[in-house]
Amino acid sequence: EEDGFCQPYRGIACARFIGNRTVYMESLHMQGEIENQITAAFTMIGTSSHLSDKCSQFAIPSLCHYAFPYCDETSSVPKPRDLCRDECEILENVLCQTEYIFARSNPMILMRLKLPNCEDLPQPESPEAANCIRIGIPMADHHHHHH
């Protein structure tokens, strides 16, 4: 069995960001399992006092695109599109710094999903980053934090 599949997103939790676009899943049954995890995580997030508005505005779509990455249409084999490293870093180090610290010390929040590790993403100017998924975090506002 080949590992990795492109299939239409059939869930509800991330539908407002993903619609029914084609997403990459590591195995055929994974979409349902991750949908359950994301739904549980969003329920927990919704009742949590640990999540600020400035963080949730971008963290939730980012988590959706990380959990259910678009398929890379330019690839001949099933391949996920990654988050953009610059946005990932602003999210982790600026907008959601305290939330990330809390989430890392509470792995049960995401259960079967790892938190995005920005260091694993290709550098912004590299060819591998050309097709990354951009959430639309306003860069300029945080540019001075970033350097």
Partner: antibody, heavy 120, light 107 residues
Amino acid sequence: EVQLVESGGGLVQPGGSLRLSCAASGFNISGYYIHWVRQTPGKGLEWVGYISPLAGNTYHADSVKGRFTISADTSKNTAYLQMNSLRAEDTAVYYCARDSRRYVRPLDYWGQGTLVTVSS
Amino acid sequence: DIQMTQSPSSLSASVGDRVTITCRASQDVNTAVAWYQQKPGKAPKLLIYSASFLYSGVPSRFSGSRSGTDFTLTISSLQPEDFATYYCQQHYTTPPTFGQGTKVEIK
């Protein structure tokens, strides 16, 4: 079919070098961490290190730091373990294994292993 | 580094027996413990991860549980193909560390 195949093992003298390869098929290594784990004859498992092939980040166990280097070539879908300044205690079967970058599912596929013998 | 202390180091059992193997972490690892099975001359195979999740294709007679820093692998009814060495591993922090192994032999 998901497969990891190690090669490059053999007999080497103390102080010598070897380069092990881990060729992956059935999946793209960019979406995974590739780990190296070794097993000394009749003993347990020891983690050697891993690489995140997409970004090239590597982590090594203290016991091999400065002597072993992990690398990857995503175009060849292959990871490597360069072993320098080999010692008798490095004698082991070396396995590569994958670990999803996205999902909590540790070391779900392993290669068959390649034997490295360090002896004069 | 986190130490994983596994016990017993070996055990003898018969087909149909219920077998329990324990692993104790030297510090909190949450639920981040995996169990592997290894047969002579073969690579380890993943059985359980995140303490209690059964890996795809693994028979339901295998189960895992957690109590604090103690983790248990249970084989509810030992089958002939289950005679092997079992290892626990924490996947909470780098470096990931393994237990010393438990060899399950035929009585």
